[in-house]
């Protein structure tokens, strides 16, 4: 056997046709190398490892109780260049690469404080913006809108993470915008608000609404305006959270765990690192025997639907696949 050069972060199998596997797969309790060398000379059970046995359920084709995948034909479990179409946000959230963040509009009318709590419950906060480009991304999204109804215009007004603090009441109200919640990153602040005479009597703090103007004829997709409103008013709102690993079943995956990313390829297996799939490897599936025309199952690795008129409908070539 020629000397094997695996990439950094990979384990070199001692023998067999599989030569390199991701390093975290070593000593995880599930043999991957054909000669099982990845599970030899491992620490005794119970010793801490950064990627322990509890993580393996998330790995496609290596579930408990089933046979581990067999590998043929190709020497190395192929690393995959990760592409941006793979999900980094749960369903209903919109991903923006520029800030590595996910955004979601909630149309349920809530006051500012309830809206903030709702965002916190989904591991986010009311959105603030660090750049003009980020704001423009948000404005360009086609957020799900309800059927046109009473208050239709107001559906496009969203609580966001700023407050206007009144500092003086001379000829008119004077104040300044502030980020509403500590810990928000560097942000730009909204323009000065207009104050309605009816709302300017007692409140010393107003809350920010971003109004998006999506209209069929609009060429200017970032047409918008800002409002300082009474925080007790009910409004739709915009939450923002850090991007996260999301698996093919739309489950959020924690740091360090294995998963099959949301996207086009159910045969990918990756490690979640800082919200990004890393060290991805792909299984190669054999063509189903005795079937000329077939379609891949979008959710299951190495499962095929035979489209031949006389063919049996379901094939599973995982056993002759390769990771």
């Amino acid at each position: 056997r020629p000397e094997l050069r695996c990439n950094p972060g990979q384990f070199a199998c001692h023998g067999g046709t599989i030569q390199c596997i991701p390093l975290p797969w070593q000593c995880d309790g599930w043999p991957t190398c054909e000669d099982k060398s990845d599970e030899a000379d491992c620490p005794v059970t119970g010793e801490a490892r950064p990627y322990g046995k509890e993580t393996v359920d998330l790995r496609q084709g290596r579930a408990r109780g089933g046979d581990p995948t067999h590998f043929h034909t190709v020497n190395v479990a192929q690393p995959v260049r990760f592409s941006s179409f793979l999900g980094k946000c749960p369903s209903g959230w919109h991903h923006y690469e520029g800030t590595a963040s996910c955004y979601r509009v909630y149309l349920s009318g809530e006051n500012y404080w309830d809206a903030a709590q709702t965002c916190q419950r989904v591991n986010g906060s009311l959105a603030t913006f660090s750049t003009d480009q980020e704001l423009r991304f948000v404005l360009a999204q086609e957020w799900d809108q309800p059927e046109r109804s009473f208050g239709w215009k107001d559906q496009r007004k969203l609580w966001v993470g700023y407050q206007y603090v009144i500092t003086g009441r001379n000829h008119s109200l004077e104040g300044r915008w502030e980020v509403a919640f500590k810990g928000s990153p560097e942000v730009f602040l909204p323009p000065d608000p207009i104050f309605a005479s009816a709302m300017s009597e007692n409140d010393n703090v107003f809350c920010a609404q971003l109004q998006c103007f999506h209209f069929p004829t609009l060429r200017h997709h970032d047409l918008h305006s800002w409002h300082a409103e009474s925080c007790s008013e009910k409004s739709s709102f915009l939450c923002k959270r850090s991007q996260t690993c999301v698996d093919i079943k739309d489950n959020v995956v924690d740091e360090g765990f294995y998963f099959t990313p949301k996207g086009d390829d159910p045969c990918l297996s990756c490690t979640c690192h800082r919200g990004e799939p890393e060290m991805c490897v792909a299984a190669l599936c054999e063509r189903p025997q005795g079937c000329q025309q077939y379609r891949k199952d979008p959710k299951e690795c190495c499962k095929f639907m035979c489209l031949d008129p006389d063919g049996s409908s379901l094939f599973d070539s995982m056993a002759s696949g390769m990771r």
Epitope: K153, L189, P191, I194, Q211, L218
Partner: antibody, heavy 115, light 107 residues
Framework: EVQLVESGGGLVQPGGSLRLSCAAS????????MSWVRQAPGKGLEWVSV???????YYADSVKGRFTISRDNAKNSLYLQMNSLRAEDTAVYYC?????????WGQGTLVTVSS | QAVLTQPPSLSVSPRQTVTITCSGD??????VSWYQQKPGQSPMLVIY???RRPSGVPERFSGSNSGNTATLTIGGTQAMDQADYYC?????????FGGGTKLTVLG
């Protein structure tokens, strides 16, 4: 108190150029959306251009490619560079704070394009 | 581009109520602002977001907007309300003004 003061208007020949200025006080130009709106003699109001706090700029079709809006944050001022002027650009030019609603206006400066 | 249509002129007696209309296709779907402009002066915002009155604008000014028509109503009109009034909204222009209504207070 918010104040906007325009200057730079005057008589110019067709095809000529002019630069209008708007000095702001009582608020910060760079953190607001600032627009130019014009009014031809005896006519109604016409929006000309806007600059967002983030720097994005937009123009009415009638001036696109000829006019340029800009600002000087240090001077807290707004500008409108007008090139290739036409007779139909004759108007009082107002600088205004805002974008979808204009809450403060300057007193205006008259631009006359005539040979 | 949206076209906002206003009556060119209206007259009203002092202390009466006058309504200035502004019509445009599906105007109720967009927010409308109203401006007052007295001769030789700059425009001044009197209503924004259909029905909101900025600080300092008298209570006699009110607004509404639904269907294809926005209205500015001045209750108990005073001589000082004599001016031109413009409605304004946004469209792909993206900002559009009505042609203006000259309000004359009689007497």
């Amino acid at each position: 108190e918010v104040q906007l003061v325009e200057s730079g208007g005057g008589l110019v020949q067709p095809g000529g150029s002019l630069r209008l200025s708007c000095a702001a006080s009582g608020f910060t130009v760079s953190s607001n959306y600032m627009s130019w709106v014009r009014q031809a003699p005896g006519k109604g109001l016409e929006w000309v251009s806007v600059i967002y706090s983030g720097g994005s700029t937009y123009y009415a079709d009638s001036v696109k490619g000829r006019f340029t809006i800009s600002r000087d944050n240090a001077k807290n001022s707004l500008y409108l560079q007008m090139n290739s002027l036409r007779a139909e650009d004759t108007a009082v030019y107002y600088c205004a704070r805002g974008w979808t609603t204009f809450d403060y206006w300057g007193q205006g400066t008259l631009v006359t394009v005539s040979s | 581009q949206a076209v906002l249509t206003q009556p060119p002129s209206l007259s009203v007696s002092p202390r009466q109520t006058v309504t200035i209309t502004c019509s445009g296709d599906q105007l109720g779907d967009r927010y409308v602002s109203w401006y007052q402009q007295k001769p030789g002066q700059s425009p001044m915002l009197v209503i924004y977001q259909d029905d909101r009155r900025p600080s300092g604008v008298p209570e006699r000014f009110s607004g509404s907007n639904s269907g294809n028509t926005a209205t500015l109503t001045i209750g108990g009109t005073q001589a000082m309300d004599q001016a031109d009034y413009y409605c304004q909204t946004w469209d792909n222009s993206p900002v559009v003004f009505g042609g203006g209504t000259k309000l004359t207070v009689l007497g």
